[in-house]
């Protein structure tokens, strides 16, 4: 290989060992019959050398640095050449470095031809191995602007006082042009300006200077976004840290087209603007940091540009002004991430503050819109608390557990609507009365409706799940001893059509000791499946539940258990079941931890089934499934 550097070229070539490999045989640069591991070639020198091995690219790297002095004479502006040409260099991983020094008052602009650049974060690499590392200067301090790959949106970077650009090319890459030019500009009065151009839909992730380390103190950095007028842009902060400010405040400022309040100032922790039409600027302003404990300011953010959806021009009013203790969250439903570009899906408050999730609280009227290609990617979760603090006032009071129509009219699917029902301890209990009788979901008879009610204890220490219930069964009411949550969960978009079938009334009733009582009025010709709460995990220790099963005069009920034994093993106490005829009070008592479960039994009158648990040993839990079937009476036994 022969490298000749012109006399006044201000180029230095350095060939040195790269990251050491586990290759057994060392390799050397052979020059003047000397075996060396580093070779420096300066301006005006002409040198011939070889390598002592067949694959020097596995051992060596080459750095070509050109110093461009704009201090003492005119600056060589225009397209930057790769000098020496890559065809004259050994096939090693190579880094071309241009170090431009200029006066503080001079702005320098790097202009990148297509493909534009895409910034990458720490630990990331470029698919083709071609990276651009750009740094600036504040007095004597080097500031890293960022590392970039090809195929992005960054078209120009403006700096002042100097710029260092390093282009890294892998040894096998055929590229023979720098892909950028340098132009002079007037002073930009800030650290740098990065221009990002979107031709169509897409996203760009950008970072503050020195990321992930701290942004220089009291500096200003601006990003200019060029967005076609027919598209919409949204900003979201992926990661940020604030430093400890002594004077001034760290902030971001937006110049947004059409805004009457430019610049719009946001704290970094604020929701950032979205649904912006056309070009806009974003600036990051640092502060004077505390000398003792400066902390670090850093920011990584994403700009998403996409077509405005039909929905984005529609405003939806969600009136929660008459609601109390309620919150509504619109958020992305969990999905597997695909690798291709997926347009963002945002919900916007007042059409400006857009984010991937939004929580609305009661007491206000909210105007929302959507910036989303497919609203099925979002869902809604609502929580409402109904609490009674004064038992004298609440007794016999009823509340309708109904999803408000405002919410049903939103173009987003409702996932969960949870009511937290709170009562004063040991003073009141609750009764749930559905508009339509409920069916308990079991493996044997699963619910196939578009929604279900999930009923569970709302006492933090208590792990008690009563079950999942859907309209179209035999459960007339559910009484529970204390605080519960009732969640209406939807399973299909057809819930909108079936919404009329929802309807549950909760009433506060005098306190009772049992954990739960289910009132069951079976219909003829249908088999009712019932199971103990906490199925699969077992009925909690020392818990008692009852089923009040009605039998019409002309019918007989067959009670069938689906196991021979309960399977429970008690550590302390006894587990038992009582089956009691309501008319005669006659009862049968079964020891669940000892006896076999009763064979199918026939009941001509309404009866109780009561199950009470002991403290079981772990792994030997109490789970019971039984069914009730009505058949017409053939002989009148009265």
């Amino acid at each position: 290989f022969e490298i000749a550097l012109p006399r006044e070229s201000n180029i230095t070539v350095l060939i040195k060992l790269g990251t050491p490999t586990l290759l057994a045989k060392p390799c050397y640069i052979v020059i003047s019959k000397r075996h060396i591991t580093m070779l420096s070639i300066k301006s005006g020198e002409r040198i011939v050398f070889t390598f002592s091995c067949q694959s020097p690219e596995n051992h060596f790297v080459i750095e070509i640095q050109k110093n461009i002095d704009c201090m003492s004479g005119p600056c060589p502006f225009g397209e930057v050449q790769l000098q020496p040409s890559t065809s004259l260099l050994p096939t090693l991983n190579r880094t071309f470095i241009w170090d431009v020094k200029a006066h503080k008052s001079i702005g320098l602009e790097l202009q990148f031809s297509i493909p534009r650049l895409r910034q990458i974060g720490p630990g990331e690499s470029c698919p083709d191995g071609v990276t651009h590392s750009i740094s600036g200067r504040i007095d004597a301090t080097v500031v890293r602007i960022g590392t970039f790959c090809s195929n992005g949106t960054v078209s120009r970077i403006k700096m002042q006082e100097g710029v260092k650009m390093a282009l890294h090319l892998p040894w096998f890459h055929p590229r023979n042009v720098s892909g950028f030019s340098i132009a002079n500009r007037s002073s930009i009065k800030r650290l740098c300006i990065i221009e990002s151009v979107f031709e169509g839909e897409g996203s760009a992730t950008l970072m503050s200077a020195n990321y992930p380390e701290g942004f220089p103190e009291d500096e200003l950095m601006t990003w200019q976004f060029v967005v076609p007028a027919h598209l919409r842009a949204s900003v979201s902060f992926l990661n940020f840290n604030l430093s400890n400010c002594e004077r001034k405040e760290e902030r971001v400022e937006y110049y947004i087209p059409g805004s009457t309040t430019n610049p719009e100032v946001f704290k970094l922790e604020d929701k950032q603007p979205g649904n912006m039409a056309g070009n806009f600027n974003l600036s990051l302003q640092g502060c004077d940091q505390d000398a003792q404990s400066p902390g670090i300011l850093r920011l990584q953010f994403q700009v998403l540009v996409q077509h405005p959806q039909n929905e984005s021009n529609k405003i939806y009013v969600v009136d929660l002004s008459n609601e109390r203790a309620m919150s509504l969250t619109i958020e992305p439903r969990p999905v597997k991430q695909s690798r291709k570009f997926v347009p963002g899906c945002f919900v916007c408050l007042e059409s400006r503050t857009c984010s991937s999730n939004l929580t609305l609280t009661s007491g206000s009227k909210h105007k929302i819109s959507f910036l989303c290609d497919d609203l099925t990617r979002l869902w809604m979760n609502v929580e409402k608390t109904i609490s009674c603090t004064d038992h004298r006032y609440c007794q016999r009071k009823s509340y309708s557990l109904q999803v408000p129509s405002d919410i049903l009219h939103l173009p987003v699917e409702l996932h969960d609507f949870s009511w937290k029902l709170l009562v004063p301890k040991d003073r009141l209990s609750l009764v749930l009365v559905p508009a339509q009788k409920l069916q308990q979901h079991t493996h044997e008879k699963p619910c196939n409706t578009s929604f279900s009610y999930l009923v569970a204890s709302a006492i933090p220490s208590q792990d008690l799940y009563f079950g999942s219930f859907c309209p179209g069964g035999s459960i007339k009411q559910i009484q529970v001893k204390q605080n519960i949550s009732v969640t209406l969960r939807t399973f299909a978009p057809s819930f909108q059509q079936e919404a009329s079938r929802q309807g549950l009334t909760v009433s506060f009733i005098p306190y009772f000791k049992e954990e739960g009582v289910f009132t069951v009025t079976p219909d003829t010709k249908s088999k009712v499946y019932l199971r103990t709460p906490n199925w699969d995990r077992g009925l909690p220790s020392l818990t008692s539940v009852s089923w009040n099963i009605s039998v019409p005069r002309d019918q007989v009920a067959c009670l069938t258990f689906f196991k021979e034994r309960s399977g429970v093993v008690c550590q302390t106490g006894r587990a038992f079941m009582i089956i009691q005829e309501q008319r005669t009070r006659a009862e049968e008592i079964f020891s669940l931890d000892e006896d076999v479960l009763p064979k199918p039994s026939f009941h001509h009158h309404s009866f109780w089934v009561n199950i009470s648990n002991c403290s079981p040993t772990s792994g030997k839990q109490l789970d019971l499934l039984f069914s009730v079937t009505l058949t017409p009476r053939t002989v009148d036994l009265t």
Epitope: V30, I31, S32, K33, R34, I36, L39, S40, I41, K42, E45, R46, I47, V48, F49, T50, S52
Partner: antibody, heavy 119, light 112 residues
């Protein structure tokens, strides 16, 4: 253009130390691949290579004279020095310095300096 | 040390006639980088030596193309296609592959 010029005492007494200087221009001895060799030629006889100094200060000597030779870079950037201790009549010769670079050896020679050792 | 044996000791040539000098080394001059460091020098009377050929066959700039070098391993030859008056002097071969560098004894070219 490249030039080299040797200078020395001309005459020395036996057992004295010879100090020779090679002053050069047109190249830099800090350039990778560069080197300067010393060669001598007794009158009417053949050439004998003595020592070589590389750009990175690495040195090579003729084993037959190694114990008496020292080659070094001068305080001036454009000089190479050669010292030969305990000279005797056999050291009477014309001493040349010659440049080598990464392309090849001995491409430029000085005009030579003559040394006579009297007993 | 590598011994360089040059023949003939003296060469008497008529102007315009060709001339050939042989140089043999006691071991191969092929270096690990695939190059052979064999040089031909001419020392005209009263002058310092001047390099004519390097790396066996590469002609120095300003050297007439009537000079040519050839050979490999241990056998090398310098040829002058048509001798001219300015060619007289002593020709030396020099190996710089192995330390210590060694010169051939020289071949004196005389004009008949």
């Amino acid at each position: 253009q490249v030039t080299l010029k040797e200078s020395g005492p001309g005459i020395l007494q036996s057992s004295q130390t010879l100090s020779l200087t090679c002053s050069f221009s047109g190249f830099s001895l800090s350039t990778a691949g560069m080197g300067v060799s010393w060669i001598r030629q007794p009158s009417g006889k053949g050439l004998e290579w003595l020592a070589h100094i590389y750009w990175d200060d690495d040195k090579r000597y003729n084993p037959s004279l190694k114990s008496r030779l020292t080659v070094s870079k001068g305080t001036s950037r454009n000089q190479v020095l050669l010292k030969i201790t305990s000279v005797d009549a056999a050291d009477t010769a014309t001493y040349y310095c010659a440049r080598s670079d990464s392309f090849g050896d001995f491409d430029y020679w000085g005009q030579g300096t003559t040394l006579t050792v009297s007993s | 040390d590598v011994v360089m044996t040059q023949t003939p000791l003296t060469l008497s040539v008529t102007i315009g006639q060709p001339a050939s000098i042989s140089c043999k080394s006691s071991q191969s001059l092929l270096y690990t980088n695939g190059k052979t460091y064999l040089i031909w020098l001419l020392q005209r009377p009263g002058q310092s030596p001047k390099r004519l050929i390097y790396l066996v066959s590469k002609l120095d700039s300003g050297v007439p193309d009537r000079f040519s070098g050839s050979g490999s391993g241990t056998d090398f030859t310098l040829k002058i296609s048509r001798v001219e008056a300015e060619d007289l002097g002593v020709y030396y071969c020099l190996q710089s592959t192995h330390f210590p560098y060694t010169f051939g004894g020289g071949t004196k070219l005389e004009i008949k």
